[in-house]
Amino acid sequence: QEGKFSGPLKPMTFSIYEGQEPSQIIFQFKANPPAVTFELTGETDNIFKIEREGLLYYTKALDRETRSTHNLQVAALDANGAIVEGPVPITIEVKDVNDNRPTFLQSKYEGSVRQNSRPGKPFLYVNATDLDDPATPNGQLSYQIVIQLPMINNVMYFQINNKTGGISLTREGSQELNPAKNPSYNLVISVKDMGGQSENSFSDTTSVDIIVTENIWKAPEPVEMVENSTDPHPIKITQVRWNDPGAQYSLVDKEKLPRFPFSIDQEGDIYVTQPLDREEKDAYVFYAVAKDEYGKPLSYPLEIHVKVQDINDNPPTCPSPVTVFEVQENERLGNSIGTLTAHDSDEENTANSLLNYRIVEQTPKLPMDGLFLIQTYAGMLQLAKQSLKKQDTPQYNLTIEVSDKDFKTLCFVQINVIDINDQIPIFEKSDYGNLTLAEDTNVGSTILTIQATDADEPFTGSSKILYHVIKGDSEGRLGVDTDPHTNTGYVIIKKPLDFETAAISNIVFKAENPEPLVFGVTYNASSFAKFTLFVTDVNEAPEFSQYVFQAKVSEDVAIGTKVGNVTAKDPEGLDISYSLRGDTRGWLKIDHVTGEIFSVAPLDREAGSPYRVQVVATEVGGSSLSSVSQFHLILTDVNDNPPRLAKDYMDLYFCHPLSAPGSLIFEATDDDQHLFRGPHFTFSIASESLQNDWQVSKINGTHARLSTRHTDFEEKEYVVSIRINDGGRPPLESTVSLTVTFCSCGEDGCFRPAGHQPGIPTVGM
């Protein structure tokens, strides 16, 4: 049948299950003149053959675990043996069957864990191998804890990552493990292939003995340090200790202070490096971190608290150079004139900041001295003697001594005698009518001018008018500023108006004096005015609940997986339609109604993470206003990139004849993320036929050395196939080729005929 089992020479891939006895031909290649025969080369392993007439077949059952892919080449030759077509690559993929059971690398594992270790952080890995294909269920292993001994209150203290075999503490284990109670535990772990999902899976078990050790990585007690210390600095104030020697300690100032007066040495001792000032900062919270030699944190940071103890190093200070109070002529004895409030920067509610007030001088002393008294601790001035007469003495000056337990300060008070407040403010209008404003009127705008008058003594607290909104504005959207010269009130917008919550407001103003009214006089209707505020609707765009929405998924999620969602609301209550903008890779779609975001194509961390798109929320109906937010999709890595050579290795050569076995170094890489430990590639010669001549040895996780096994090479080019495995989960493998030339060498390296001059040799013999 042309096409499936026969056809012209072209690159092809065939899949054959391992273990199957050969039962039929693989393919019949058809020759095009002048081709008359075919030739097969590559990784035949003496299993794959081609008849001269183009019949490709195999002679015995394949074993995927021996070779998972056979890279063959087929060429068409003419009647003189010259290649006239090809060679073309023919790939035989050996498909896996579950013919291998998983096996733990050890029958017994031992490990230790510190109490209070972070839950979920592996402290020990068990590792099983299964020779079957890790890209199929046959080689996908699933780990499970079968038994935990002892088991207290049926609570599991340990958990295992079913994919990686990493054993860690559960939340309960982190909180409750105590070496004083139970210093050791035993786990029985099972591993199953078929991802643990099949009755037909193979399994193995292993035993894990775990010792619980004490955790001394604990936050110390809070430290108290007296300010302005005159002792030599630095002064040790506390210490932290990692569980093992060799940790590198550092302090982290989360507050980003301009001056951070603490340090830590490599023993874990913490010092204050200079005198502290409680009035600058009364407490410090910072963190002690322990890291390994690679700078990687060994555990969570410890919070260090330092409280700065106060000393009395600050004198009282007056509120202003002169404090002015007013007193009406007819004030009664004992009435409060005002309160002098001095300040002391020392710690509040302690003896260091407790202030005493005392009047040390009154001028003039008319009609007598001692007209005023001050409450010793409160600072309230009261009238101590008869009522005052403005025509006799319109102004008094007091000198008041304010003291704490160590310092004294003099403050000055001016008392003005004013007429009695027997007139109330009277509005010029009781109703300021209606006012209509759009809800987007600017904050700070003056929307109305109001005016009241007061017949009391001008420019005193008896005639000064303060306006208050006492009704109709519970949200505090309006305010009134008073002109001190004219008592005109300017009504301003303090907070944005909102049609949706307050379309009509019936506003009531009250006009008052800062001075109390005389006995028998009260504010009446003349001191009140009203107006009605109508707010008109302005269609507003929808509002997102966040400016940036962020989600995290694995790069290998299935197409159609929900990867995140966004929400917006329309102030007018209209429905919202969501859309995406800037989805340059065509990875995502959004549900127009719910805002849920789904993948519609394979994601790829290596193409860029986070993947940033814009989300647009548009009103349905109305003015179709829209607003934009950001959606950032963080892609976590899976091992989906096979290893490759880190660069093109051109012009590798050895001088012929070899005097001794030679070697050269090459580097592998891949595009996956290698957090913490970096790549861990393994290397092997890909073809049995090459193994007598070449060997490859690993230098580190990325570099390997290709060496000759002998010196008996012809003067020609050799193509050496090398298999590189990245050891990932699942492990990916690829076969790369290094072309090595054995050639006559001159002073400038490898001699080749004109037209192919190599570069400077990259290989030293």
Partner: antibody, heavy 122, light 108 residues
């Protein structure tokens, strides 16, 4: 035993054509290609082309494309080389030769004809 | 086309001498595709060595060949009277098949 017997010497005028034959015996004619070479007096050998009688596949050297014609008569196990538009520089000894069986892995001219002398002269 | 350059073009030697003829190819070829032929005056060439180093049927063992890449040699370890002839190298790697210009071996 294998033999390749060529036709006799030819004298031709410039502009004319010549057809030289090569009759083979001692092997299966269709299993081998037949190649034609020539050797000008005192010069080296020059390859003209080949024919594979089994499939009537013919390949020419670029230099002789359009002027040389290779044919084969399977019934008489004879190969022919016709050269047209003759000029004096075509004066040479013309050889037919064959390599081993086309399934072989070693290809070289293991049997040769005795040569046919062509003289082109006005 | 691949060029074949033989050296020397001619060579005088005596019976019993060791003689080496070289053939340089203008581009690298597989050693299995380089052959040597011997031609005597008035006769067709006859195969001497194929695949660089394999003696053709009936060729005495005093003839040998070696080389790889672009440089190949024909060696006669001890010249015999019947060895005086013209020798050609030929490549079977690319069409058109090409021959060296020949090396004429004469009696000194």
């Amino acid at each position: 035993q294998v033999q390749l017997v060529q036709s006799g010497a030819e004298v031709k005028k410039p502009g004319s054509s010549v057809k030289i034959s090569c009759k083979v015996s001692g092997y299966t004619f269709t299993d081998h290609t037949i190649h034609w070479m020539r050797q000008a007096p005192g010069q080296g050998l020059e390859w003209i082309g080949y024919i594979f009688p089994r499939d009537d596949i013919v390949v020419y050297a670029q230099k002789f494309q359009g002027r040389a014609t290779l044919t084969a008569d399977k019934s008489t196990s004879t190969a022919y080389m016709e050269l047209s538009s003759l000029r004096s520089e075509d004066t040479a000894v013309y050889y037919c030769a064959r390599p081993p069986y086309y399934y072989s892995r070693n290809f070289y001219f293991d049997y040769w004809g005795q040569g046919t002398t062509l003289t082109v002269s006005s | 086309d691949i060029q074949m350059t033989q050296s020397p073009s001619s060579l005088s030697a005596s019976v019993g001498d060791r003689v080496t003829i070289t053939c340089r190819v203008s581009s690298i070829i597989s050693s299995s595709k380089l052959h040597w032929y011997q031609q005597k005056p008035g006769k067709a060439p006859k195969p001497l060595i194929y695949g660089t180093s394999t003696l053709a049927s009936g060729v005495p063992s005093r003839f040998s060949g070696s080389g790889s890449g672009t440089d190949y040699t024909l060696t006669i370890s001890s010249l015999q009277p019947e060895d005086f002839a013209t020798y050609y190298c030929q490549q079977w790697s690319n069409y058109p098949f090409t021959f060296g210009q020949g090396t004429k071996l004469e009696i000194k």
